[in-house]
């Protein structure tokens, strides 16, 4: 927790941010909360980015004030205006770009004082993997596909029955650049699969970790997948 200290007689107010990651091409949230103030017209929210001359976003007197906004953020930012009164200064960032990564400062002024907190924002691409039985292959084979990742992730296979086994010798992973020349499609194939077992395809980079599970029995196939961002920590 980082507490913003007041300057020149004003009290300090607590401002809290959460490090987060943005999925390029999609919308992201830069999270920031502060001690609420009942005087909405006195609240000022400023978002700044290290190395950027203009403001990322400014909200004051109940509305956006974008005259000082940096060109790279033009038309891409918004606060949750109806939530400001209860202490939510989070910023919605539209169409996240790779270049949006960096250190942001959420700076708050209220009638009670001032405070700020920094936020590390990572950008990349991450997506949910899907594991399927590859019926085209000559032997029992699983195929794990995830459409968008960046930076290039690692792919590791695991199995419930053979816990701790190393599947690198019986798997093959490829990365195919997508049309926008940044993100890549991940395809990993696992050979010599046995029936009545649960296999997991784990894809991970420094931003996210995703797992696709498949359970193959004689009568049915069950799939499950989940994705987790790695660097969400409060400041």
């Amino acid at each position: 927790l980082i507490i913003g200290f007041g300057i020149s007689g004003r009290h300090s107010i607590t401002v809290t941010t959460v490090a987060s990651a943005g999925n390029i091409g999609e919308d992201g949230i830069l999270s920031c909360t502060f001690e609420p103030d009942i005087k909405l017209s006195d609240i000022v929210i400023q978002w700044l980015k290290e190395g950027v001359l203009g403001l990322v976003h400014e909200f004051k007197e109940g509305k956006d004030e974008l005259s000082e906004q940096d060109e790279m953020f033009r038309g891409r930012t918004a606060v949750f205006a109806d939530q400001v009164i209860v202490g939510n200064a989070s910023l919605r960032l539209k169409n996240v770009q790779l270049t949006d990564a960096g250190t942001y400062k959420c700076y708050i002024i209220t009638s009670k004082g001032k405070g700020n907190a920094n936020l590390e924002y990572k950008t990349g691409a991450f997506s949910m993997p899907e594991v399927n039985v590859d019926y085209n292959a000559s032997s029992e084979t699983l195929r794990c596909e995830a459409p968008r990742w960046f930076p290039q992730p690692t792919v590791v296979w695991a199995s419930q029955v053979d816990q701790g086994a190393n599947f690198s010798e019986v798997s093959n992973t490829s990365f195919e650049l997508n049309s926008e020349n940044v993100t890549m499609k991940v395809v990993s194939v696992l050979y010599n699969v046995t029936i009545n077992n649960t296999y997991s395809c784990m894809i991970e980079n420094d931003i996210a970790k995703a797992t696709g599970d498949i359970k193959v029995t004689e009568s049915e196939i069950k799939r499950r997948s989940h994705l987790q961002l790695l660097n969400s920590k409060a400041s």
Epitope: E35, P36, I38, K39, L40, G62, A81, I85, V86, K112
Partner: antibody
């Protein structure tokens, strides 16, 4: 579930003081403003003031400065309002109301104060 | 202090009608306006926030609109449970102030 439970009906003499309570459950009491609103019989709503329990900060409607005193006991998640030098004009229903997700989003059931000699 | 002028102060309507209540502020309140419904002997209940957003559980026949200093609450296809008192609240500038209220009665 958010609940604001207010103390019961009060009968008081002119010139006396009364203290009413508002017990909060279901949200982080210390981190959000708690407000008090007055409603005279058959009349509209009038904002009295608010308290931020985490720091005991208070804000008052100028019309109620010296009339109302707001306090809170964080360990009991309870807000209090004391009204002093009571007159007939103070006879009303008094509501506590939170600003948790939005301004005045949850309300207590009200405390009826009757001032009579 | 911002004054909120609510009109009409009372009105009667029939089931199925569409009605509109207005609130005018003495200055621009930048959409910082909520609406509340109150039934006899009960506390007000949260209806609409930030001019046009419906509070949880509020039927879609209720809607709010406005900007600057002029705001309105519309109820379309009135139902029996809608007959009550309605109040607007501005929270843009200190102190927060309510409109005088509108009593909606059945015709």
């Amino acid at each position: 579930e958010v609940q604001l439970q207010q103390s019961g009906t009060v009968l008081a003499r002119p010139g006396a003081s009364v203290k009413m309570s508002c017990k909060v459950s279901g949200y982080p009491f210390t981190s959000y403003w708690m407000h008090w609103v007055k409603q005279r019989p058959g009349q509209g709503l009038e904002w009295i003031g608010a308290i931020y329990p985490g720091k005991s900060d208070t804000e008052y409607n100028p019309n109620f400065k010296g009339k109302a005193k707001l306090t809170a006991v964080t360990s009991a998640t309870t807000a209090y309002m004391e009204l002093s030098s009571l007159t007939n004009e103070d006879s009303a229903v008094y509501y506590c109301t939170s600003t948790w997700t939005h301004y005045f989003d949850y309300w207590g059931q009200g405390t009826t104060l009757t001032v009579s000699s | 202090e911002i004054q909120m002028t609510q009109s009409p102060s009372s009105m009667s309507a029939s089931l199925g009608d569409r009605i509109t209540i207005t609130c005018q502020a003495t200055q621009d309140i930048v959409k910082s306006l909520n609406w509340y419904q109150q039934k006899p002997g009960k506390p007000p209940s949260f209806l609409i926030y930030y001019t046009a957003q419906l509070a949880e559980g509020v039927p879609s026949r209720f809607s709010g609109s406005g900007s600057g200093s002029d705001y309105s609450l519309t109820i379309s296809n009135l139902e029996s449970e809608d007959f009550a008192d309605y109040y607007c609240l501005q929270f843009y500038e200190f102190p927060p102030t309510f409109g005088g209220g509108t009593k909606l009665e059945i015709k």
